[in-house]
Interface confidence: low
């Protein structure tokens, strides 16, 4: 037996007399030879759950679920009532009803098995029957919602009437019925009023009923209408076992070049038409077993459950579902030697579905683990500038696929054949496997007998041993000229293009910095700055070879603190800046500032501000004046 | 309300090919899975080939694989059938069908279907 | 693959009788049995998914049970717009089958 309301409303008036009809609870069944029994709990409770006094007022027919007034609610017991209020207004009233049978002891009111009723108090007498209106006539206050159990016997859930007004105004005439599409689930006899099922209810063909209940209030000659909301939910029971959308049970799956603990290998779907068990519960009910294997499968592989409300369509309306998301996860790093084929079964089982049939599935996994190969080209060519700063990134190398490589280790080294002309260093970059050059030692890249470096590229994976071999030929071009005297070390330090261009920093693979105009847009990813080579920096990712050096690309790689308009990098850097970033290293600082370029939007106001706080204020107040700005522009 | 559409059936010769097309429309289509069912004259239902939501899960009954290919256009709302190497047995009523998306694999909703007639 | 055998293949019944159709599975599918209706001349429409649920809109006079190998689809009292040709479908695995259908004409 369950509530069809978790709560219900009525009005309450001193001196209402004893006998007054006041409401009907209703419970329906979940099995047809069930019998309802109400009873009352022994205490009225106020605000805040406070016990208020033992309830000699209000008694209910343990057969029908009608409340009614034992005996009347004078002056002096409202008084009595709210003294004992926490000092506050009494406004409300509730009782609990509870389905027998329950516990005797007046606990906690949960739905399904108890139900609140609420009194909202007058400290006045009925009033007169003429002066309600007719929405007072017809429905409580508080708007009811009902819940309605799928699958259960049809069966009474709501009373129209007003009992009170029925019982203190018979002259005043009160008609009800529902607005409903045809072929609808629910019934209101004319008679008694009584809203009932005509049968169970699916709730995976319809989980929400948007009803409308009309009232036509006659008194005397005139008649009015009154319309409410009647909505009713239906309750969801594991009673739909999972199944395979498509028909597809199987998932084949090819492990290659993606070998790195946690990746997913393989997801099968698995479509289950109910919401229950609750999220809270769902790991727990609805298990899923990685069938033994050998202990190598075991060990490699492990199933994660990804369940997710989805809605689905059914007879012209939408209603919630789950999909469970099945992953076939490598639980550790796989060598590149590693080469077998393997068939993977997975249990899952709805426990609490109740057939018929069963609620288990299973799940078929085919892997096949393939190795991999090391292999780099014959040869490479490469050309650098003789004016090129050390940690200038001037080529990559890349064994086959490596882009497509993750958990797999390999490792660059370059052997050059002349002792004195190895002007080059490599790194494995994390990203993509692949290994990153860079000049490593100007001083040899400047001698004249330097102008042909020749290199073997070694590509190893140290957990097999495995290598790749190819021949590196850099050639060395034009002439070294010396740099301006006064440039700073890093390319980041200028804010202007003609002070950018004129200097080198470290990572120029020219000799040169680069000026990289933005595009002016606010706080922008394309932010105006100098880099030493705009191919990689900035482009929101600190590599390998920038870790080097901070002097190199502070744009990306920065852990200080940016000033300005900007939006930090993940973890580091400047992920998007306001008109021109430029960053002092040692400082650990970068600020983003206007273009000094003059913008029409740039008034007087704010040429005077900026005047201001560039000549008069200090450097705290000077930053705050530059946000303002910053403001003015934005705006 | 659902409809789904048929076209592209007609007399086909042995050995050539023909393309069937079905054009859903009144629910979206993109969301379910979509099959074709086959029913040759006078006789029972055989189920042909399905196709997922995504286009990603292809599955053919053994008697038309390499033969036949189930494809779709979502932004078309249209399912094929591409059929090739066609002979006598593949005469038939093709229906194409909507997966029911409350039951797993149940067809809810069928098109009128088209004939394909195999004969030289 | 798993195979679908329908009994009777026809049977001959008036207008209020009880009908019984049969369908067996070669293996267990546990709920996974869907039954449909087809007339002459038009496409099947479901009747019952799960082996026991009627499809919204269908008269509750059909009726489906079974669980495991064995099914039944029933008809309560048969009307006239019931004689048509009946087929049992297993969505347990791939591919789908049919059973072989049962023709139920007028006595």
């Known amino acids: 037996l369950y509530f069809s309301r978790d709560a219900y409303w009525e009005k309450l008036y001193v001196d209402q007399p004893a006998g007054t009809p006041l409401l009907y609870v209703h419970a329906l069944r979940d099995a047809p030879e069930e019998v309802p029994s109400f009873r009352l709990g022994q205490h009225l409770y106020g605000t805040y759950r406070t016990r208020l006094h033992e309830n000699n007022w209000i008694c209910i027919q343990e057969d029908t679920g009608l409340l009614y007034l034992n005996r009347s609610l004078d002056r002096s017991s409202w008084e009595k009532l709210s003294g004992r209020n926490r000092g506050f207004p009494l406004l409300t009233v509730y009782l609990k009803v509870f389905l027998s049978p329950t516990s005797l002891r007046e606990g906690e009111c949960q739905w399904p098995g108890c139900a609140r009723v609420y009194f909202s108090f007058f400290n006045t007498s009925f009033p007169a029957c003429t002066s309600l209106k007719p929405r007072e006539l017809c429905f409580p206050e508080t708007r009811p919602s009902f819940r309605i159990r799928e699958n259960r016997p049809p069966g009474t859930f709501h009373q129209f009437r007003l009992l009170p007004v029925q019982f203190l105004c018979p002259n005043i005439s009160v008609a009800y019925r529902l607005l409903e599409g045809e072929g609808l689930p629910f019934r209101c006899a004319p008679d008694s009023l009584e809203v009932s099922t005509r049968w169970a209810l699916d709730r995976e063909q319809r989980e929400k009923y948007e009803l409308v209940a009309v009232c036509t209030v006659h008194a005397g000659a005139r008649e009015e209408v009154v319309m409410v909301p009647f909505p009713v939910t239906v309750y969801d029971e594991d009673d739909s076992a999972p199944t395979f959308p498509a028909g597809v049970d199987t998932a084949s799956a090819v492990v290659e070049f993606k070998r790195k603990e946690d990746t997913v290998v393989a997801t099968l779907r698995v479509f289950d038409a109910d919401v229950v068990p609750a999220s809270g519960e769902l790991v727990r009910r609805y298990t899923s077993t990685l069938l033994p294997g050998d202990t190598w499968t075991q060990q490699t592989f492990r199933v994660e459950h990804w369940p997710n409300e989805t809605s689905v369509q059914a007879n012209g309306s939408f209603v919630r579902a789950t999909v469970h998301d099945y992953r076939l996860v490598l639980n550790r790093n796989l060598s590149i030697s590693e080469n077998r084929t393997m068939q993977l079964a997975v249990l899952v089982n709805d426990s609490d579905f109740q057939g018929p049939g069963a609620g288990v599935l299973l799940l078929h996994f085919n892997v096949s683990v393939l190795p991999v190969s090391l292999h780099l080209p014959s040869s490479y060519s490469l050309s650098v500038s003789r004016r090129a700063r050390r940690f200038a990134q001037i080529g990559k190398v890349c064994v086959e696929n490596c882009q497509a490589f993750s958990g797999i280790n390999v490792q660059y080294e370059l052997h050059s054949s002349g002792a004195n002309c190895s002007t080059l260093g490599v790194v494995t970059s994390a990203e993509d496997t692949s290994g990153i050059l860079f000049v490593n030692d100007t001083k040899a890249l400047r001698r004249p007998k330097c102008a042909e470096l020749h290199y073997m590229v070694v590509a190893t994976n140290h957990q097999t041993s495995r290598q790749a071999q190819a021949q590196l030929l850099v050639t060395v071009e034009g002439l070294y000229v010396a740099e301006e005297a006064g440039c700073p070390l890093s390319c980041a330090v200028s804010k202007r293009r003609p002070e950018c261009e004129e200097c080198g920093g470290l990572g120029s693979p020219t000799g040169r910095c680069e000026w990289r105009q933005g595009d002016g847009k606010g706080i922008t990813r394309n932010f105006s700055t100098c880099s030493p080579s705009t191919k990689t920096c900035p482009d929101g990712h600190c590599d390998v070879v920038e870790t080097q050096d901070i002097n190199i690309c502070p744009q990306d790689c920065l852990r200080g603190s940016i000033v300005g308009g900007h939006e930090p990098g993940e973890p580091r850097g400047i992920k998007a800046g306001y008109g021109t970033c430029n960053c002092f290293p040692e400082e650990e600082k970068c600020f983003c500032e206007p273009e000094d370029i003059q913008d029409p939007l740039c008034d007087e106001l704010c040429r005077e501000q900026k005047l201001i706080s560039e000549e008069d204020l200090g450097g705290e107040q000077k930053l705050i004046s530059e946000e303002d700005l910053h403001h003015h522009h934005h705006h | 309300q659902v409809q789904l559409v048929e076209s592209g059936g007609g007399v086909g010769q042995p050995g050539r090919s023909l393309r069937l097309s079905c054009v859903a429309s009144?629910?979206?289509?993109?969301?379910?899975?979509m099959h074709w069912v086959r029913q040759a004259p006078g006789k029972g239902l055989d189920w042909v080939a399905i196709?997922?939501?995504?286009?990603?899960?292809?599955y053919n009954v053994d008697s038309v694989k390499g033969r036949f290919t189930i494809s779709r256009d979502n932004s078309k709302n249209t399912l094929y059938l591409q059929m090739n190497s066609l002979g006598a047995e593949d005469t038939a009523i093709y229906y194409c069908?909507?997966?029911?998306?409350?039951?797993?694999?149940?067809?809810?909703?069928w098109g009128q279907g088209t004939l394909v007639t195999v004969s030289s | 693959d798993i195979q679908m055998t329908q009994s009777p293949p026809s049977l001959s019944a008036s207008v209020g009788d009880r009908v019984t159709i049969t369908c067996r599975a070669s293996?267990?599918?546990?709920?996974?049995l869907n039954w449909y209706q087809q007339k002459p001349g038009k496409a099947p429409k479901i009747l019952i998914y799960?082996?026991?649920r009627l499809q919204s809109g269908v008269p509750s006079r059909f009726s489906g049970s079974g669980s495991g190998t064995d099914f039944t689809l029933t008809i309560s009292s048969l009307q006239p717009e019931d004689f048509a040709t009946y087929y049992c479908?297993?969505?347990?695995?791939?591919?789908?089958?049919f059973g072989g259908g049962t023709k139920v004409e007028i006595k």
């Open positions: 069908a909507r997966e029911s998306p409350i039951t797993g694999t149940t067809f809810d909703y």
């Open positions: 009144g629910f979206t289509f993109r969301n379910y899975g």
């Open positions: 196709i997922g939501y995504d286009g990603s899960k292809e």
């Open positions: 293996q267990s599918i546990g709920n996974y």
């Open positions: 799960a082996a026991s």
């Open positions: 479908q297993q969505s347990y695995s791939t591919p789908l089958t």
